[in-house]
C-alpha cells in the first residue's frame, strides 16, 4: 500500500515507522527508557493514544481511520535525555480520486454487499480494491466477487462472513497508470449494517373471543437473543375505507413471541404482518407476508 510517510524529527531520530496493515507504530528502542508515549492527531485535532508499557517500542492503534491524513507522534524519555518525533501520514494521490459514498449492508444473515462510487477526479483507468480486516484476529479478507461498472470495481459481494467480528476495518485502495489514487477507509459495526429478514413462521389462531399471533425471531448474522428484538405488528381489517388507520402494535422480544388480542366472532376478514428490528437501533426489516384470518361475511 503506497503512502508517503514524512518524518519531522530532531537531530537524533527515533526512526519512527508505521505499518498500516497492522496499524502498528514502532520506533528504535532507547537504552534506560523511563517513559514513552505514542499518539496520533487527526485533521479535526482529535487525539488517539493507545496504552503503552514503558519497555515497549511500539504501539498498536485499534480503531482508527486514516484517509483524512493523520500525524503520529512519539515521546521517549531516557535517564539521559528526551526524544520526540512526528510522523506525517498523508493520503497521497490526487485529491478526489478515492472511492466515495462507501456503504455496506449484511442481509439474509450471511451475505454482505458493499458499494462505492468512483472518485470525481479519478482517471478512466482507475481500479479499486476492497480489503477488510476484523478487529480481533486482524486477518485480512480480500473481496472475492467485485461488482463492476464499465470495468471499474464499484462494489463487492461476500457470501462468507466467517472472518468478520463485531467491528471491522474496510479499506478501498485504488490504482491507475496515470496518477496516484487516494485510499478510503472506514470502521463499521456489523450490528449497525445488518438488515434483518422479517420474522418467520407467523401463525394466527382464533377462538370465540381472542386471536393469538405467534412468530419466530429472524435468523441473523449477529448472535442475538430474544431480548435484542423489537417487533411491530400491523393488524389490518380488510375492505375498509381508504385512509383508515392500520393498528400498529409494538411488542418486545420474548422467548415465546406472541400477541393475544380481543376479537370476537363473527369476525371480519383481517390480515396481520410483522416486522423486526434491533431494539437499540430500530432498523426495521421488511414486512412478513400478510396472513389472513376471519371471514368475508364477518
Amino acid at each position: 500500500e503506497k503512502s508517503d510517510l514524512r518524518t519531522v524529527a530532531p537531530a537524533s531520530s527515533l526512526n519512527v515507522r508505521f505499518d498500516s496493515r497492522t496499524m502498528n507504530l514502532s520506533w528504535d528502542c532507547q537504552e534506560n527508557t523511563t517513559f514513552s508515549k505514542c499518539f496520533l492527531t487527526d485533521k479535526k485535532n482529535r487525539v488517539v493514544e493507545p496504552r503503552l508499557s514503558n519497555n515497549e517500542c511500539s504501539c498498536t492503534f485499534r480503531e482508527i481511520c486514516l484517509h483524512e491524513g493523520v500525524t503520529f507522534e512519539v515521546h521517549v524519555n531516557t535517564s539521559q535525555r528526551g526524544f520526540q518525533q512526528k510522523l506525517l501520514y498523508p493520503n497521497s494521490g490526487r485529491e478526489g480520486t478515492a472511492a466515495q459514498n462507501f456503504s455496506c449492508f449484511i442481509y439474509n444473515a450471511d451475505l454482505m454487499n458493499c458499494t462505492w462510487a468512483r472518485g470525481p477526479t479519478a482517471p478512466r483507468d482507475v481500479q479499486y480494491f476492497l480489503y477488510i480486516r476484523n478487529s480481533k484476529r486482524r486477518r485480512e479478507i480480500r473481496c472475492p466477487y467485485y461488482i463492476q461498472d464499465s470495468g471499474t470495481h464499484v462494489g463487492c459481494h461476500l457470501d462468507n462472513l466467517s472472518g468478520l467480528t463485531s467491528r471491522n476495518y474496510f479499506l478501498v485502495n485504488g490504482t491507475s497508470r496515470e496518477i496516484g489514487i487516494q485510499f478510503f477507509d472506514s470502521l463499521l459495526d456489523t450490528k449497525k449494517i445488518e438488515r434483518f429478514n422479517p420474522p418467520s413462521n407467523v401463525t394466527v389462531r382464533c377462538n370465540t373471543t381472542h386471536c393469538l399471533v405467534r412468530w419466530k425471531q429472524p435468523r441473523t448474522y449477529q448472535k442475538l437473543s430474544y431480548l435484542d428484538f423489537q417487533y411491530q405488528l400491523d393488524v389490518h381489517r380488510k375492505n375498509t375505507q381508504p385512509g383508515t388507520e392500520n393498528l400498529l402494535i409494538n411488542v418486545s422480544g420474548d422467548l415465546e413471541n406472541r400477541y393475544n388480542f380481543p376479537s370476537s366472532e363473527p369476525r371480519a376478514k383481517h390480515s396481520v404482518k410483522i416486522r423486526a428490528a434491533d431494539v437499540r437501533i430500530l432498523n426495521w426489516s421488511s414486512w412478513s407476508e400478510a396472513i389472513e384470518f376471519g371471514s368475508d361475511d364477518g
Epitope: 467480528t165 448472535k223 442475538l224 437473543s225 430474544y226 431480548l227 435484542d228 422467548l255 415465546e256 437499540r280
Partner: antibody, heavy 120, light 111 residues
Framework: QVQLVQSGAEVKKPGASVKVSCKVS????????IHWVRQAPGKGLEWMGG????????VYAQRFQGRVTMTEDTSTDTAYMELSSLRSEDTAVYYC?????????????WGQGTMVTVSS | QSVLTQPPSVSGAPGQRVTISCTGS?????????VSWYQQLPGTAPKLLIY???KRPSGVPDRFSGSKSGTSASLAITGLQAEDEADYYC???????????FGGGTKLTVL
C-alpha cells in the same frame, strides 16, 4: 412455558467434585445459550461462565478457570456445570440462566438454584 | 470487592418513589456498556427487571424504570409496594473480560 429445572441440593467434602444439572423444558437447548452464576450465603451474584458467540465457545470466569467444566446434552435438553477441587468457600447456590442478550450479557430467565454445601 | 458500587440498603414507605444507584467506571458502564437490573425476592432466584439500560421484559410493571448517564446507572421504583421488598443487583460488562459483572446488591426495605 419455558422453564429451567435444576438438580437437588448436594453436600460434598473438600477436594471432591460436584455436577449440577439444568433441564430446559418448553424449548430446545440448541436454540438457547445457558450461563451459570453462583451466590454464596448472604453474598452477591458471581458470574461463572457460559457460551460466548464472539469466541464461539464456552468461556469461564478467570477465577474458575481449570476447575469448572460446562457441558450440554442436546438429546435431553440438559446443561451441566461441574466444579472440581471443592473448598468451603464454594458453598453457594448455583443458578443456570438463559441468555436474553449477548451484548452485554443479560440473563433473561433463571433456574430455581441448586444449593451446594462443602463441609468436612 | 465489586467493580460496580451500589448502596447496601435503601428504604421507602408504600406509595413512595425510591432510586437505587450503580456506579461504575470508564471500563464498564462508561465504556459505554448497557446496564441490566435484577430483582431477587427473599429465598428465590433472581429475576430480570431492566435490560439495555431502560427496557422492561414483558410482565415487569412500568413502576420500574432504568436510566444511565456517564459511568452511573440507576433504578427507580415508583408507587412502592410491600412485595417490592427484595435485593436489587445491577450488572454490565468489564472491558476486555467475558461475561457479566454484578454490583454488590442493594436491600430494599418497604417501611
Amino acid at each position: 412455558q419455558v422453564q429451567l429445572v435444576q438438580s437437588g441440593a448436594e453436600v460434598k467434602k473438600p477436594g471432591a467434585s460436584v455436577k449440577v444439572s439444568c433441564k430446559v423444558s418448553g424449548y430446545t437447548l440448541t436454540e438457547l445459550s445457558i450461563h451459570w452464576v453462583r451466590q454464596a450465603p448472604g453474598k452477591g451474584l458471581e458470574w461463572m461462565g457460559g457460551f460466548d458467540p464472539e469466541e464461539n465457545e464456552i468461556v469461564y470466569a478467570q477465577r474458575f478457570q481449570g476447575r469448572v467444566t460446562m457441558t450440554e446434552d442436546t438429546s435431553t435438553d440438559t446443561a451441566y456445570m461441574e466444579l472440581s477441587s471443592l473448598r468451603s468457600e464454594d458453598t453457594a447456590v448455583y443458578y443456570c440462566a438463559i441468555v436474553g442478550s449477548f451484548s452485554p450479557l443479560t440473563l433473561g430467565l433463571w433456574g430455581q438454584g441448586t444449593m451446594v454445601t462443602v463441609s468436612s | 470487592q465489586s467493580v460496580l458500587t451500589q448502596p447496601p440498603s435503601v428504604s421507602g414507605a408504600p406509595g413512595q418513589r425510591v432510586t437505587i444507584s450503580c456506579t461504575g467506571s470508564g471500563s464498564n458502564i462508561g465504556a459505554p456498556y448497557d446496564v441490566s437490573w435484577y430483582q431477587q425476592l427473599p429465598g428465590t432466584a433472581p429475576k430480570l427487571l431492566i435490560y439495555h439500560n431502560n427496557k422492561r421484559p414483558s410482565g415487569v410493571p412500568d413502576r420500574f424504570s432504568g436510566s444511565k448517564s456517564g459511568t452511573s446507572a440507576s433504578l427507580a421504583i415508583t408507587g412502592l409496594q410491600a412485595e417490592d421488598e427484595a435485593d436489587y443487583y445491577c450488572a454490565t460488562v468489564e472491558a476486555g473480560l467475558s461475561g457479566s459483572v454484578f454490583g454488590g446488591g442493594t436491600k430494599l426495605t418497604v417501611l
